[in-house]
Interface confidence: low
């Protein structure tokens, strides 16, 4: 019987209760490998989840997150709320980045501005909550009378 079961392809299961050894997976189920004794229930994408790929007889459905959320974990096992650029998600919801930090994405945490002076450079454009600082050439590299092409933006 084991030899016969191993002949059952993906999309079927080895049904010991029927004369036809390989039975197709029932609706809303799948088997991604051959020789399986049961088909797995298809994942349903509900609530904060939306369907990215429909379930087929040989592969599980894949979920994504609805607008305003982004995936976390393997196979998008959870959805986390988006924040705006310049914010990070805390236990109390979305909070603005503290001064000296930024976040240029809808997810993740606020990160410190680059310290230009560590590389011996000067700040060409000031940082904001949404953007990192832009470092320019070191003060010594600027010839007398030369000015930077972009004036520093006012800090927010």
């Amino acid at each position: 019987l084991q030899d016969l079961c191993s002949n059952c392809p993906a999309g079927t299961f080895c049904d010991n209760n029927r004369s036809q050894i390989c039975s197709p997976c029932p609706p809303n189920s799948f088997s991604s490998a051959g020789g399986q004794r049961t088909c797995d229930i298809c994942r349903q994408c509900k609530g904060v989840f939306k369907t990215r790929k429909e379930c087929s007889s040989t592969s599980n459905a894949e979920c994504d997150c609805i607008s305003g959320y982004h995936c976390l974990g393997a196979e998008c096992s959870m959805c986390e709320q988006d924040c705006k650029q310049g914010q990070e998600l805390t236990k109390k919801g979305c909070k603005d980045c503290c001064f000296g930090t930024f976040n240029d994405q809808k997810r993740g945490i606020c990160r410190p501005w680059t310290n230009c002076s560590l590389d011996g450079k000067s700040v060409l454009v000031n940082g904001t909550k949404e953007r990192d600082v832009v470092c320019g050439p070191s003060p010594a590299d600027l010839s007398p009378g030369a000015s930077s092409a972009t004036p520093p933006a006012p800090a927010r």
Epitope: T38, I41, R43, K46, G47
Partner: antibody
Amino acid sequence: EVQLVESGGGLVQPGGSLRLSCAASGYSITSGHYWAWIRQAPGKGLEWVSSISGYGSTTYYADSVKGRFTISRDNSKNTLYLQLNSLRAEDTAVYYCARGGSDAVLGDWFAYWGQGTLVTVSS
Amino acid sequence: DIQLTQSPSSLSASVGDRVTITCRASQGIGSFLAWYQQKPGKAPKLLIYDASNLETGVPSRFSGSGSGTDFTLTISSLQPEDFATYYCQQGYYLWTFGQGTKVEIK
């Protein structure tokens, strides 16, 4: 008819461990419903603790138990487990096993409940 | 996480009264809300799922309504066996219960 029977509760000292079991009958735990543990401290409300998916092995935990509790199942025994480690006094509660009422990726409600098993954490 | 706030926390009513319990979610949860009844020493019993669907075997005097953030459980004519604690629960993102509403005899 779906029946859920919990066992494994008892008195344990702070820092100790327990393993709760939930034997399911009338339904396969590998079918497309979520399975959960929900607890209720004496005189308090209901608190969801942990869930495991029926279609795979995705697990979820409440922040209050993350890293201390582990949900698992034995398909051959049709039994759900909750391993409780590093127990604290605030973990004292009746622990219920429950089955989600839909095959949603996050089950929307709990249609079937066990009778509960009491865990008391005290020195 | 999504928080659910029930009101009132407790209420006193008489047999035959119309009773309304509300549940407010901290963010929109569509219709992914359920209501349970629990009596002392017993497991909770599902009454309503998907905000307004009556569970099989539950008397028709129980009804649920609402979507988004505001939900209501109504008992049209309170019966002696209805004195219990009622909980709402969301399944939109993980699982959360409200703190409960105790319905007592006046």
